[in-house]
Each structure stands twice: as structure tokens, then as C-alpha cells.
Interface confidence: low
């Protein structure tokens, strides 16, 4: 039987290489059973994670999984850094692994690092 605890599926050490000026969506995959938890995004600043309260977010629902999305419209150079999503569930705070955005300024686009979204084998969710 599957656990009914809320789970946040951000992979450890995940990272995205993105270009300043582009739109981007940062996904926090959330698994829950009955009631959708309250989820927030924060940006790491040293040892603290600063809550992103004034940013555009949305939910995308799929079967068996939902996504809490942080929108970058567009990506700015100072969006570079590490982010974490957290869920409040039955008075418990569940935190995801951090995910890092590497933002390359348009002016130096030719030097943009070519990082694949995932270097290791794919993790098959249902297969």
C-alpha cells in the first residue's frame, strides 16, 4: 500500500542551465492522497531559505502527481541560485532537496554551459 505522506520529488543535486530573457518553469512534483498541501518556494541565501511570496506560481495536475510551479517570466541574471519547495501537511513541514538554476546572461550566450537535464539513466515512474 502506498504511503499517504506528502512527498516532494525534486532529485538531489538537480540543476537547470537556463538563459536570461527566456521564460522558465521550475517544477516541484508533489504526491499527496486526499487534500492538496500548501506548498511554497524559497531561495537559498547561505543557510536560510528566503520565502518567495510575491512570485507567480501555479498548480498543474496530472494523474498520480501534481506540480507546484514557480514561473520566471522572464529569467533574470539574479535568478541564479538554489531553490527549495516545502509543503505544510498535517502541521508538518516537508522540504524538498534543493535544485539549482545556472543562469547565463544573453550577452555571453555563446559561453552557455551545455548541461543535459539529466545525465544518468532515466527514472521510470510507472514502467
Amino acid at each position: 500500500k502506498e504511503s499517504c505522506d506528502v512527498q516532494l520529488y525534486i532529485k538531489r543535486q538537480s540543476e537547470h542551465s537556463i538563459l536570461a530573457g527566456d521564460p522558465f518553469e521550475l517544477e516541484c512534483p508533489v504526491k499527496y492522497c486526499a487534500n492538496r498541501p500548501h506548498v511554497t518556494w524559497c531561495k537559498l541565501n547561505g543557510t536560510t531559505c528566503v520565502k518567495l511570496e510575491d512570485r507567480q506560481t501555479s498548480w498543474k495536475e496530472e494523474k498520480n502527481i501534481s506540480f507546484f510551479i514557480l514561473h520566471f517570466e522572464p529569467v533574470l541574471p539574479n535568478d541564479n541560485g538554489s531553490y527549495r519547495c516545502s509543503a505544510n501537511f498535517q502541521s508538518n513541514l516537508i522540504e524538498s532537496h534543493s535544485t539549482t538554476l545556472y543562469v547565463t546572461d544573453v550577452k555571453s550566450a555563446s559561453e552557455r554551459p551545455s548541461k543535459d537535464e539529466m545525465a544518468s539513466r532515466p527514472w521510470l515512474l510507472y514502467r
Epitope: Y9, E15, F24, E117, P122, Y126, R127
Partner: antibody, heavy 124, light 107 residues
Framework: QIQLQQSGPELVKPGASVKISCKAS????????MNWVKKRPGKGLEWIGR????????NYNGKFKGKATLTADKSSSTAYMQLSSLTSEDSAVYFC?????????????????WGTGTTVTVSS | DIQMTQSPASLSVSVGETVTITCRAS??????LAWYQQKQGKSPQLLVY???NLADGVPSRFSGSGSGTQYSLKINSLQSEDFGSYYC?????????FGSGTKLEIK
């Protein structure tokens, strides 16, 4: 081993209906979307729609609304597509295809397992 | 609905050559793109998923690239078994439309 076995060829008259099947094995049928795709001779692939067998929820390409009806039977791990009011334009090979997911630094989708294809010929 | 514009429609090439097929989405699809190969009378086969990841068993001469609205499939050193039709497909919200296809023929 994941497999999708489709029903045999159909020869049907214009105006009639046909129901083709796709039997899945080797994976959790009820918790994975099943897609249907049309291929006409000399034409490209067209996405018809998909069904989630767990609860019967379906999404359709607007072009096929009213033409195709998707259903699924969890007990037999079989997906069905009924095509109605058939015309020569519906003569094609129809494929079912299982939708997979992977997780990198985001979720992504793809059709990784395909059925053998069912040929439907509409002729008087 | 998102439209996928695939080019070229056909290519006539020799074994050993390199080819690139492109797909343009009508809006940002955030790498939610797959590439398939289909041979005459056969079922399509997944080649690349999430724009850049090779499916199991696909030779390394195939590679996918792109982001945003522009994506491409590159085949290095074409082999005789690579001839057939190629399609892109987006997964950025239903309907999951395909590109119009590229037919790869032997010169």
C-alpha cells in the same frame, strides 16, 4: 516484458462503426495513460487522444471529438477505441501507445511502447 | 493547441552522411518533446525523449537537442537501417500533436 497487442484488421462499410482493442501486459495498466494514434497511407501520424484506465478520464484531439470514443476495461487490461460514422478518410492504421514518464530535473512524457497496429478499411 | 512545424518534409541522402531534422513549436514546450522513427508497415519507435535523452537501445549516432520552441534530431553517419520516416511530438498539454514528418530516403 511490456506488450500491447491489438485486434485484427477490419473491413467496414461507410456509415458503420468499428471498435478496436489493445490488450496491455507487463505493466500497471490502470495507472498509465493509453494513447491512440492514426496513420494514413502517405500521411503523417495524428494523435487521436488518450485515456486513463484508472478512472476512465480521457483527452481528445478536437479533430476526433465525435469520431473516436475511448474506453478501458481494468479487469482485462484492455483499452478500446470506437470509431463512428466511418468514411474513406477513416481508412488507416490505428496504433495504441503506452505513455511513459521520467524524472530528471523535471517530469517529461513520451510514448515508449506501441501496439502492433490495427488496419481499418472503409469500403462499400 | 500547440502546432509543431517539422522540416524538411523529405531528404534524399547517402549512407555515411549526417542529417539534421528540425521541429519548431508554436510556443515554448519546455523540452517536453519526443522523436520517433517509423518504417513502412511497422509501429513507430521512440528514439529520443525530453528533447535530449536517447531511449534504451538507440544507437549513439542519434542525438536530440534544443529548448524553448526549437528542437532538432541529428543522425551522424547514416546507416541503411536508418531510412524511414521521423516524427517529433510535443507533450506540453493535450492534444499532443506530432510534426508532419520527415521521410529519409536513400540517394
Amino acid at each position: 516484458q511490456i506488450q500491447l497487442q491489438q485486434s485484427g484488421p477490419e473491413l467496414v462499410k461507410p456509415g458503420a462503426s468499428v471498435k478496436i482493442s489493445c490488450k496491455a501486459s507487463g505493466y500497471a495498466f490502470s495507472s498509465s495513460w493509453m494513447n491512440w494514434v492514426k496513420k494514413r497511407p502517405g500521411k503523417g501520424l495524428e494523435w487521436i487522444g488518450r485515456i486513463y484506465p484508472g478512472d476512465g478520464d480521457a483527452n481528445y484531439n478536437g479533430k476526433f471529438k465525435g469520431k473516436a470514443t475511448l474506453t478501458a476495461d481494468k479487469s482485462s487490461s484492455t483499452a478500446y477505441m470506437q470509431l463512428s460514422s466511418l468514411t474513406s478518410e477513416d481508412s488507416a492504421v490505428y496504433f495504441c501507445a503506452g505513455e511513459g514518464h521520467y524524472y530528471g530535473s523535471g517530469y517529461r512524457w513520451y510514448l515508449d511502447v506501441w501496439g502492433t497496429g490495427t488496419t481499418v478499411t472503409v469500403s462499400s | 493547441d500547440i502546432q509543431m512545424t517539422q522540416s524538411p518534409a523529405s531528404l534524399s541522402v547517402s549512407v555515411g552522411e549526417t542529417v539534421t531534422i528540425t521541429c519548431r513549436a508554436s510556443e515554448n514546450i519546455y523540452s517536453n518533446l519526443a522523436w520517433y522513427q517509423q518504417k513502412q508497415g511497422k509501429s513507430p519507435q521512440l528514439l529520443v525523449y525530453a528533447a535530449t535523452n536517447l531511449a534504451d537501445g538507440v544507437p549513439s549516432r542519434f542525438s536530440g537537442s534544443g529548448s524553448g520552441t526549437q528542437y532538432s534530431l541529428k543522425i551522424n553517419s547514416l546507416q541503411s537501417e536508418d531510412f524511414g520516416s521521423y516524427y517529433c511530438q510535443h507533450f506540453r498539454g493535450a492534444p499532443f500533436t506530432f510534426g508532419s514528418g520527415t521521410k529519409l530516403e536513400i540517394k
